[in-house]
């Protein structure tokens, strides 16, 4: 988790002097509770936005937006803590809005936004906005949280972001797999425009089961420039095991931008359809 400095970290708006600060996610009001605390945020919204840096690189960011409730507690609102928690790693990053002037009611509801948290493809986050100071122990909670799922690199908008392109999202291998005679598979795919090697990982399974009955790895050396964007054809020999008929072919590239961690593409060959066994015809007719 990190912040993108594609624009100045600003939280001031007409009628409010405010500054954005790094936060340890442990506000002082946890340790020194206050008697009077503000109410919770209202209408917290999280959206996927896209930000180009000064150099033009494109990153997905979480656009966080919320409003204030129209009660007297805004007189005691000193700021807000924004927290983003990546659910699969438990990594958390926080920033603090510090109000340098007192809020007053005005003709429009107060609204705040922040679009600087860079999010990763195919990750889920919990976004929390805590109004400050935080409540006393057993006080009513004054935060709002929402979960936010970021699409993966297959998503059209995500595909062209820098993190997705770095993992090889623009490569479409268009894999085809056909079963040949004599227990063989022919795998064909389109090479990318980089002199890098590939690996074909074959895993075979019985008809209706998920434990593998055969595994094989095939190395494809780096293509020459004249072979870029051409089809590569590989014939793989299968183990002659009856019923080991469902094959998953996975192609792993080793592009310089992602090395061992590039997006893999796969194709599956199903077991051949078994013809329905016809009912046996009795060779005599019962007379009763």
């Amino acid at each position: 988790l990190r912040l993108l400095d594609h624009r100045a970290l600003v939280c001031s708006q007409p009628g409010l002097n405010c500054t954005v600060k790094n936060s340890t996610c442990l506000d002082d009001s946890w340790i020194h509770p206050r008697n009077l605390t503000p109410s919770s945020p209202k209408d917290l919204q999280i959206q996927l936005h896209f930000a180009h840096t000064q150099q033009g690189d494109l990153f997905p960011v979480a656009h966080i937006e919320w409003t204030l409730q129209t009660d007297a507690s805004i007189l005691y609102l000193e700021g807000a803590e924004l927290s983003v928690l990546q659910l699969n790693t438990n990594e958390r990053l926080c920033v603090r809005f510090e109000f340098l002037s007192k809020l007053r009611h005005h003709h429009r509801r107060w609204r705040f936004t922040f679009s600087h948290f860079v999010v990763d493809p195919d990750q889920e986050y919990e976004v929390t906005v805590h109004h400050l100071p935080k409540p006393i122990p057993d006080g009513d909670p004054n935060h709002q949280s929402k979960n936010f799922l970021v699409p993966d690199c297959e998503h059209a908008r995500m595909k062209v972001t820098t993190p997705c392109m770095s993992s090889g999202s623009l490569w479409d291998p268009n894999i085809t797999v056909e079963t040949l005679e004599a227990h063989q598979l022919r795998v064909s795919f389109t090479l990318w425009n980089e002199s890098t090697h590939y690996q074909i990982l074959l895993t075979s399974f019985p008809h209706m089961e998920n434990h593998s009955c055969f595994e094989h790895m095939h190395h494809i050396p780096a293509p020459r420039p004249e072979e870029f964007h051409q089809r590569s054809n590989v014939t793989l020999t299968l183990r002659n095991l009856k019923g080991c008929c469902r094959h998953q072919v996975q192609i792993q590239p080793f592009f310089s931008s992602c090395l061992n961690d590039c997006l893999r593409h796969s194709a599956t060959v199903s077991c051949p359809e078994m013809p329905d066994t016809p009912e046996p015809i009795p060779d005599y007719m019962p007379l009763w």
């Epitope: 936005h49 896209f50 930000a51 180009h52 150099q55 033009g56």
Partner: nanobody
Framework: QVQLQESGGGLVQPGGSLKLSCAAS????????MTWVRQAPGKGLEWVST?????????YYADSVKGRFTISRDNAKNTLYLQLNSLKTEDTAMYYC??????????????????KGQGTQVTVSS
């Protein structure tokens, strides 16, 4: 100070072509990503295309213009270009060139732009 001056707009029939230019000054042009945004009558600012700074500049396009518009830059001339082909009536808008960072939502509605020029009008009509 940063100056961005667009030119090349005009009236064109559907299916026609135009080439927009943007002359930049007041900053190190080659060090910045550059963008084209547009604003149709009565609508908000819409992101169109961005080109990276640096060698082998990466280009990005909104879905609605992909395959029809081409962004390019000439760092020696401090100029940004946008070639508009197969124009449609819905491409009618004021086109602006923008410098540096920009932020937009999933529908390409611009939320923030660092700096943009005065714009050049493109009208597609029969």
């Amino acid at each position: 100070q940063v100056q961005l001056q667009e030119s090349g707009g005009g009236l064109v029939q559907p299916g026609g072509s135009l080439k927009l230019s943007c002359a930049a000054s007041g900053f190190t042009f080659s060090s910045y990503g550059m963008t084209w945004v547009r604003q149709a009558p009565g609508k908000g600012l819409e992101w169109v295309s961005t080109i990276n700074s640096g060698v082998g500049s990466t280009t990005y396009y909104a879905d609605s213009v992909k395959g029809r518009f081409t962004i390019s830059r000439d760092n020696a001339k401090n100029t940004l270009y946008l070639q508009l082909n197969s124009l449609k009536t819905e491409d009618t808008a004021m086109y602006y060139c923008a410098k540096g960072s920009i932020e937009y939502d999933s529908d390409y509605r611009v939320n923030y732009v660092e700096a943009k020029g005065q714009g050049t009008q493109v009208t597609v009509s029969s």
